[in-house]
């Protein structure tokens, strides 16, 4: 079944290469287990950046080695991507799946364009 997901159109990463935005999905109702996947679209190519499953009983938990962190509250997920470089500029799409209990719902946002500007190296001081 289809479900709406919303995310901001544009986000500027910090000088440290960190970008945060909220992914909000159509009310989860009685969804107990939700999977959130961050996808990066470059041209026609779609790659998975990170993913996490959380339950209404627990906090959102990404793998320890993940480039993402996040917190969940109701039908909103606050996602943070770390370690971004200029070449990481692109469209980041939030995909939300209501996994359990049935019925299964899936929703994808229109994407957040994240702009990453690598900091200028400091000039050598004499």
């Amino acid at each position: 079944k289809g479900m709406h997901a919303a995310q901001p159109a544009v986000v500027l990463a910090s000088s440290r290469g960190v970008a945060s935005f909220v992914c909000e999905y159509g009310s989860s109702g009685n969804a107990a287990e939700v999977r959130v996947t961050m996808l990066r679209q470059a041209g026609s190519q779609m790659t998975e950046v990170c993913a996490a499953t959380y339950t209404v009983e627990d906090e959102l938990a990404f793998l320890d080695d993940s480039t993402c962190t996040g917190t969940s509250s109701g039908n909103k997920v606050n996602l943070t991507i770390q370690g971004l470089r200029a070449m990481g500029t692109g469209l980041y799409i939030c995909k939300v799946e209501l996994m359990y209990p049935p019925p299964y719902y899936v929703g994808m946002g229109n994407g957040t364009q994240i702009y990453v500007i690598d900091p200028e190296p400091c000039p050598d001081s004499d």
Partner: antibody
Framework: EIQLVQSGGDLVKPGGSVRLSCKAS????????MNWVKQAPGKGLQWMGW????????TYADDFKGRFTFSLDNAKNTAYLQINSLRAEDTAVYFC?????????WGQGTTLTVSS | DIVMTQTPLSLSVSPGEPASISCRSS???????????LEWYQQKPGQSPKLLIY???NRFSGVPDRFSGSGSGTDFTLRISRVEADDAGVYYC?????????FGGGTKLEIK
Amino acid sequence: EIQLVQSGGDLVKPGGSVRLSCKASGYTFTNYGMNWVKQAPGKGLQWMGWINTYTGEPTYADDFKGRFTFSLDNAKNTAYLQINSLRAEDTAVYFCARRSIYYPYWGQGTTLTVSS
Amino acid sequence: DIVMTQTPLSLSVSPGEPASISCRSSQSIVYSNGNTYLEWYQQKPGQSPKLLIYKVSNRFSGVPDRFSGSGSGTDFTLRISRVEADDAGVYYCFQGSHVPWTFGGGTKLEIK
């Protein structure tokens, strides 16, 4: 403190109707499905079905399709189980239970006795 | 419908001894997301059931580590490493993977 308090159990004659209540407190009622479980005297637990407290959509196990109705009053944080055309075999303790990915919270159970 | 078959129907164990209850499902209870929603509940006379184990092997908060769950696919086990007097009651397995969700028939644990 999360609580499910049940009421409505009674001695009812065959052919009659009854409505059992399950009042929830201590959490957001519409975030969790409410399930109903039957336990006949000296028997095991039998899953009757559940109702989505957000959409109001019920799901019934095959044995409980027809005479059984799950309903809600979200303003009162209460789930109901209505049983019509009562039979002797409906005599049981009925539990409501809140489910996420498990049942951590149960009502205390309410006893329905169907007898003439 | 998935039938959950528990064995034995009853068992009598001395305090300090281990106990094991088996639960077999009539078909795989792996849900479409890869999880197995298999739970164990304990019920004492006149009381509501209490959750012990969820998703096969996860102990619910406050449940003593004497209780453990294991298994996969269609075969599952609840183990009590050292039985105590307070463990007497009826134990039920439950599958929440495929509607209609179903309970096992129950196993009565008696303490010698």
